[in-house]
């Protein structure tokens, strides 16, 4: 229903704490360079204004849209042009163009230093002094680095953070309590970020229909006992929630997500038998829990998919009468039978089925034409299954770091023009798929591997869009989202690439590497590996292994030496010479 004052409505629905958190996230995602204090001041002003509207919905400006209110606030920031350049031009536009303009200026790779975690004692001190400010800093720092982070989920992670600090700051050994727990939250939040970015990409590039198809497949896998009408309702609601968050309408998004969680918990009987545990939790935990609830048990008596979609004489008639509904029921029926497939694969199968009907229904004898469609699915299914087997075998043999290196070599050969930091980031993220998915039961591996890889490759595409350098990457990124991963997998060595000159300074290291944390050491070594491949794209695996083993030995020796600096300056040039010879 329409409300006299949108801002009062959202404040009442969400409550002050969530309202302030969401406004802070929204401002931090739009203006990524502003300090926490600048944003905190704006948030307080907006909150005070919302309270006046709650008291009197007819008060001045209370009837304005949230975009107008928030946009006016952002545009009133001093030195906007100096700090944000052409983003300031957005302020010359009217709504809704102004908001669209802000969205277009969101930066997926902002020039911000990595978010460093303070040491335990300092963290606990500032947390105890002012938990609200501490959490505000967390929301601000994550939101500005991840401008599409799913806002209600970020509130959930902040709540997790809060609980961990409350528990660990009371312990004697704060460090050993905090580190593993916060690392766990960080890992989950980073995965959540790339997954949500993928959803927003789907929405931005291919529209609501594409996202809704994704939602139908995903929900049908999770709730195979729900009927098609129920799945359609959930998919429609979920599409609305995501559209709002991707569009920067964070208050509406969080409010609608809470409504959806409420609906699911009130209708468990027609959705799934697995929801009760989630529904017993408070709001943020409930919505998070529902988003990753385990699959319900599949009905035992499902007929073969062929009955309605191949053998039925009415296929083309049903397709003609309501294409989207018919294809939606196909996607629903296929997905509920295959929780072991990735959503990407299910969407490729639905696309193949649609293309088959488009072709066959135009023929004089359609049933004879589409009769073999399910058999034609086989190669589409086998390809990702082989990918999972090959990659999980390799991961089990090499471990995470070795597996990342293998991927780094592979992807540097596919797209050597891409910047080394981007290749290293991508390979490290792609390599984590092993730890994340290969340890799962067989029937969960494929959906885990492929949907995670698709999300990581979406980030590769977003970064490449800013500075397109590789035709290979442009080709794979230009197609549909579900075809990207197979496209990248199919890429081979880029024959058009002119190898980089060998520069000794690229492979020159100093003693400061010895004191770096293990992760940073790995990144240094992987940077060198990518540069080696750019120098010799057709180097064999053996040659690269020889060089990397030599490099690791060199680091180990010099970092243990009494005079590290001398070791690096004398042994370094010898290492460079050996590398050149090994790759000659």
């Amino acid at each position: 229903e329409a409300h006299k004052s949108e801002i009062a409505h959202r404040y009442n629905d969400l409550g002050e704490q969530h309202f302030k958190g969401l406004v802070l996230i929204a401002f931090s995602q739009y203006l990524q360079k502003c300090s926490y204090d600048e944003h905190a001041k704006l948030v307080q002003e907006v909150t005070d204004f919302a309270k006046t509207c709650v008291a009197d919905e007819s008060a001045a400006n209370c009837d304005k849209s949230l975009h107008t209110l928030f946009g006016d606030k952002l545009c009133a920031i001093p030195n906007l042009r100096e700090n944000y350049g052409e983003l300031a031009d957005c302020c010359t536009k009217q709504e809704p163009e102004r908001n669209e303009c802000f969205l277009q200026h969101k930066d997926d790779n902002p020039s911000l230093p990595p978010f460093e975690r303070p040491e335990a004692e300092a963290m606990c001190t500032s947390f105890k002094e002012n938990p609200t400010t501490f959490m505000g800093h967390y929301l601000h720092e994550v939101a500005r680095r991840h401008p599409y982070f799913y806002a209600p989920e970020l509130l959930y992670y902040a709540e997790q953070y809060n609980e961990i600090l409350t528990q660990c700051c009371a312990e004697a050994d704060k460090e050993s309590c905090l580190t593993p727990k916060l690392d766990g939250v960080k890992e989950k939040a980073l995965v959540s970020s790339v997954r949500q970015r993928m959803k927003c990409s789907s929405m931005q590039k291919f529209g609501e229909r594409a996202f809704k198809a994704w939602a139908v497949a995903r929900l049908s896998q999770t709730f195979p006992n729900a009927d098609f009408a129920e799945i359609t309702k959930l998919a429609t609601d979920l599409t609305k929630v995501n559209k709002e968050c991707c569009h920067g309408d964070l208050l509406e998004c969080a409010d609608d997500r809470a409504e959806l969680a409420k609906y699911m918990c009130e209708n468990q009987a027609t959705i799934s038998s697995k929801l009760q545990t989630c529904c017993d939790k408070p709001l943020l935990k409930k919505a998070h829990c529902l988003s990753e609830v385990e699959h319900d048990t599949m009905p035992a008596d499902l007929p073969a998919i062929a009955a309605d979609f191949v053998e039925d004489q009415e296929v083309c008639k049903n397709y003609a009468e309501a294409k989207d509904v018919f294809l939606g029921t196909f996607l629903y029926e296929y997905s509920r039978r295959h929780p072991d497939y990735s959503v990407s694969l299910l969407l490729r199968l639905a696309k193949k089925y649609e293309a088959t009907l488009e072709k066959c229904c135009a023929e004089a004898n359609p049933p004879a034409c589409y009769g073999t469609v399910l058999a034609e699915f086989q190669p589409l299914v086998e390809e990702p299954k082989n990918l999972v087997k090959t990659n999980c075998d390799l991961y089990e043999k090499l471990g995470e770091y070795g597996f990342q290196n293998a991927i780094l070599v592979r992807y540097t050969q596919k797209a050597p023009q891409v910047s080394t930091p981007t290749l290293v980031e991508a390979a490290r993220n792609l390599g984590r798929v092993g730890t994340k998915c290969c340890t799962l039961p067989e029937d969960q591996r494929l959906p885990c591997v492929e949907d995670y890889l698709s999300a990581i490759l979406n980030r590769v595409c977003l970064l490449h869009e800013k500075t397109p350098v590789s035709e290979h990457v442009t080709k794979c990124c230009s197609g549909s989202l579900v075809e990207r991963r197979p496209c990248f997998s199919a890429l081979t060595v880029d024959e058009t690439y002119v190898p980089k000159e060998f520069k000794a300074e690229t492979f020159t290291f100093h003693s400061d590497i010895c004191t770096l944390p293990e992760k940073e050491k790995q990144i240094k070594k992987q940077t060198a590996l990518a540069e080696l491949v750019k120098h010799k794209p057709k180097a064999t695996a053996e040659q690269l292994k020889t060089v990397m083993d030599d490099f690791a030995q060199f680091l180990d020796t010099c970092c243990k030496a009494a005079d590290k600096d001398t070791c690096f300056s004398t042994e370094g040039p010898n290492l460079v010479t050996r590398c050149k010879d090994a790759l000659a």
């Epitope: 004489q313 296929v315 008639k317 009468e321 229904c361 004089a364 359609p366 049933p367």
Partner: nanobody
């Protein structure tokens, strides 16, 4: 909403001719193969003839081959069935369908062949 409206039926003497039409709406007509199906009193539906979306391919039941001709005009969203050398056993309700469907989703048009 898909709609199919047949016309052109009537009473005709054996050996005579009729031309049936089917006006289609509510879907992309040119993208679908179309068929004519008939149902004689007290009997089940019987497939008569089919044509591809472009009109380039046609198929006929043995019982009508050489006597009936299926055609279409995609600019008018209309399907036709030219019936020559009609026989008493051709008496039936004729209806057009989408694809290979045998079920009727329209009223059909009655063709009676009798002297």
């Amino acid at each position: 909403e898909v709609q199919l409206l047949e016309s052109g039926g009537g009473l005709v003497q054996p050996g005579g001719s009729l031309r049936l039409s089917c006006a289609a709406s509510g879907f992309t007509f040119r993208s679908f193969g179309m068929s004519w199906v008939r149902q004689a009193p007290g009997k089940g539906p019987e497939w008569v003839s089919s044509i591809s979306g472009s009109g380039s391919d046609t198929l006929y039941a043995d019982s009508v081959a050489g006597r009936f001709t299926i055609s279409r005009d995609n600019s008018k969203n209309t399907l036709y069935l030219q019936m020559n050398s009609l026989r008493p056993e051709d008496t039936a309700v004729y209806y057009c369908t989408i694809g290979g469907s045998l079920s009727r989703s329209s009223q059909g048009t009655l063709v009676t062949v009798s002297s």
